[in-house]
C-alpha cells in the first residue's frame, strides 16, 4: 500500500468540492490538504461523503489540530460532529452560542448523545453559569435538561435565566431541585403584578414555603388542584382552612377528590372538624 501514499498526478484538490466524493479513502488522505479542509469546512456538509470518507477527513483535522480544533472549524463541522468522541470534544473551547446551536442542530431529533452532553458541559463550564440565552437554547433542544442538573449545579443559574424556563422544562424535576429554583423565580418575577406573577411562578411552586403560599392566598389566584398537589407537604400543613379556600378559589371543591392523597390528606388531619365543615365538602379530619 506504500506506493498509494503519494497523491496521483492531477488529483491534488484545489478546493473542497463535489469531485471529492469519487476519491478513494487513500486519495483523500493523500490529496486533500488539511489546512484547506479547515478553511472550507462549511462546504463539507453540502457534499454527500460516505462515513468512511468522513473518517478520513476527521483524521486529517485531528493531525492538524492535535490539541483540539479551533472554534472557527468547530462551528462548521456539521455532520462531521457525529464522528467526534467525548474525548475529542473535551479538548475544545467552545464559547460562541452560535457554535453550540449549530452542533445541537446536527443532532436534532435524536436522543442526547454522549458527544452532545459533553459539548454542553464544556460550554456551560466555560461560561461559568447558565445564562438566559444558553438556557433558552438548551431547553429548546432538550426540555428535560434543567431537571438533570443537581441542586448544586442549579444554584449557579442566575435569576435572570429563569425567564427562559417553560413549565414543561420542570416536568421531571424533583422537590430538591424546585427548592433551589423557586427562590430564583420569585426574584426574577418580583416586579410583575399579581395575576401575571402567578402565571409565571406557578410551575415553580413545588419549592414555595408556607409564608409565600399565605401571601398568594390573599391575591385571588385561583390555584388549580394539579398545582396544589405538587406543593410541599410541610408548606401546606400550616395553612388554615380559610387560606386554602382563598388560595384555590372555585377549585376548592376538588379537595374532595384528593382527600386521600398527600398533601391534602395530611392537611385535613391537621384541621379542626368545625373548620373543615365550613367548606361543605364532607371532608373528615
Amino acid at each position: 500500500e506504500v506506493e498509494k501514499t503519494a497523491c496521483p498526478s492531477g488529483k491534488k484538490a484545489p478546493e473542497i468540492d463535489e469531485s471529492l466524493i469519487f476519491y478513494k479513502k487513500w486519495e483523500l488522505e493523500a490529496c486533500v490538504d488539511a489546512a484547506l479542509l479547515a478553511t472550507q469546512m462549511d462546504r463539507v456538509n453540502a457534499i454527500p461523503f460516505t462515513y468512511e470518507q468522513l473518517d478520513v477527513l476527521k483524521h486529517k483535522l485531528d493531525e492538524l489540530y492535535p490539541q483540539g480544533y479551533p472554534e472557527s472549524v468547530i462551528q462548521h463541522l456539521g455532520y462531521l460532529f457525529l464522528k467526534m468522541s467525548p474525548e475529542d470534544i473535551r479538548k475544545w473551547n467552545v464559547t460562541s452560542l452560535e457554535t453550540l446551536k449549530a452542533l445541537l442542530e446536527v443532532n436534532k431529533g435524536h436522543e442526547m448523545s454522549p458527544q452532545v452532553a459533553t459539548l454542553i458541559d464544556r460550554f456551560v463550564k466555560g461560561r461559568g453559569q447558565l445564562d438566559k440565552d444558553t438556557l433558552d437554547t438548551l431547553t429548546a433542544f432538550y426540555p428535560g435538561y434543567l431537571c438533570s442538573l443537581s441542586p448544586e449545579e442549579l444554584s449557579s443559574v442566575p435569576p435572570s435565566s429563569i425567564w427562559a424556563v417553560r413549565p414543561q422544562d420542570l416536568d421531571t424535576c424533583d422537590p430538591r431541585q424546585l427548592d433551589v429554583l423557586y427562590p430564583k423565580a420569585r426574584l426574577a418575577f418580583q416586579n410583575m403584578n399579581g395575576s401575571e406573577y402567578f402565571v409565571k411562578i406557578q410551575s415553580f411552586l413545588g419549592g414555595a414555603p408556607t409564608e409565600d403560599l399565605k401571601a398568594l392566598s390573599q391575591q385571588n389566584v385561583s390555584m388549580d388542584l394539579a398545582t396544589f398537589m405538587k406543593l410541599r407537604t410541610d408548606a401546606v400543613l400550616p395553612l388554615t382552612v380559610a387560606e386554602v379556600q382563598k388560595l384555590l378559589g372555585p377549585h376548592v371543591e376538588g379537595l374532595k377528590a384528593e382527600e386521600r392523597h398527600r398533601p391534602v390528606r395530611d392537611w385535613i388531619l391537621r384541621q379542626r372538624q368545625d373548620d373543615l365543615d365550613t367548606l361543605g365538602l364532607g371532608l373528615q379530619g
Partner: nanobody, 115 residues
Framework: QLQLVESGGGLVQPGGSHRLSCAVS????????MRWYRQAPGKEREWLTS???????AYADSVKDRFTISLDNAKNMLYLQMNSLKPEDTAVYYC?????????WGQGTQVTVAS
C-alpha cells in the same frame, strides 16, 4: 432506548433492613438524575431520593436518615438501601432516570413491611 429493571422486593420485618436494585440498560449517558419513588395502595407516587451526575444526592424528609441511594457506574446499577423499615414503608418502589434530558421509569417492585 434506555430500560430500567427493579429487583429485590419482598417481605421485610419492621425495624429490618433491605436493599433494592435497579439495572440500567446503557452506560453511555453523561448527564443524569437517577431517582427512587414509591407508591402505596390508594396513594399518589412519592419522591424519595435522587443522585445526580456530579455525585451529590438529595432525600425527602420522610426517609432522610433511613434510606441511602447509591450508583455503581461500573455495573450500571442503582441501589436503595433501606434501614429501620416501618409498616408505612409498604409500597411499590420505582426507579426513575432523567438521563441526557429524557425521563424513563422502571416497572416497580413491591416491598411489604410486616411481621
Amino acid at each position: 432506548q434506555l430500560q430500567l429493571v427493579e429487583s429485590g422486593g419482598g417481605l421485610v420485618q419492621p425495624g429490618g433492613s433491605h436493599r433494592l436494585s435497579c439495572a440500567v440498560s446503557v452506560s453511555t449517558f453523561t448527564r443524569y438524575a437517577m431517582r427512587w419513588y414509591r407508591q402505596a395502595p390508594g396513594k399518589e407516587r412519592e419522591w424519595l431520593t435522587s443522585i445526580y451526575s456530579d455525585g451529590s444526592s438529595a432525600y425527602a424528609d420522610s426517609v432522610k436518615d433511613r434510606f441511602t441511594i447509591s450508583l455503581d457506574n461500573a455495573k450500571n446499577m442503582l441501589y436503595l438501601q433501606m434501614n429501620s423499615l416501618k409498616p408505612e414503608d409498604t409500597a411499590v418502589y420505582y426507579c426513575n432516570a432523567n438521563v441526557d434530558s429524557k425521563a424513563y421509569w422502571g416497572q416497580g417492585t413491591q416491598v411489604t413491611v410486616a411481621s
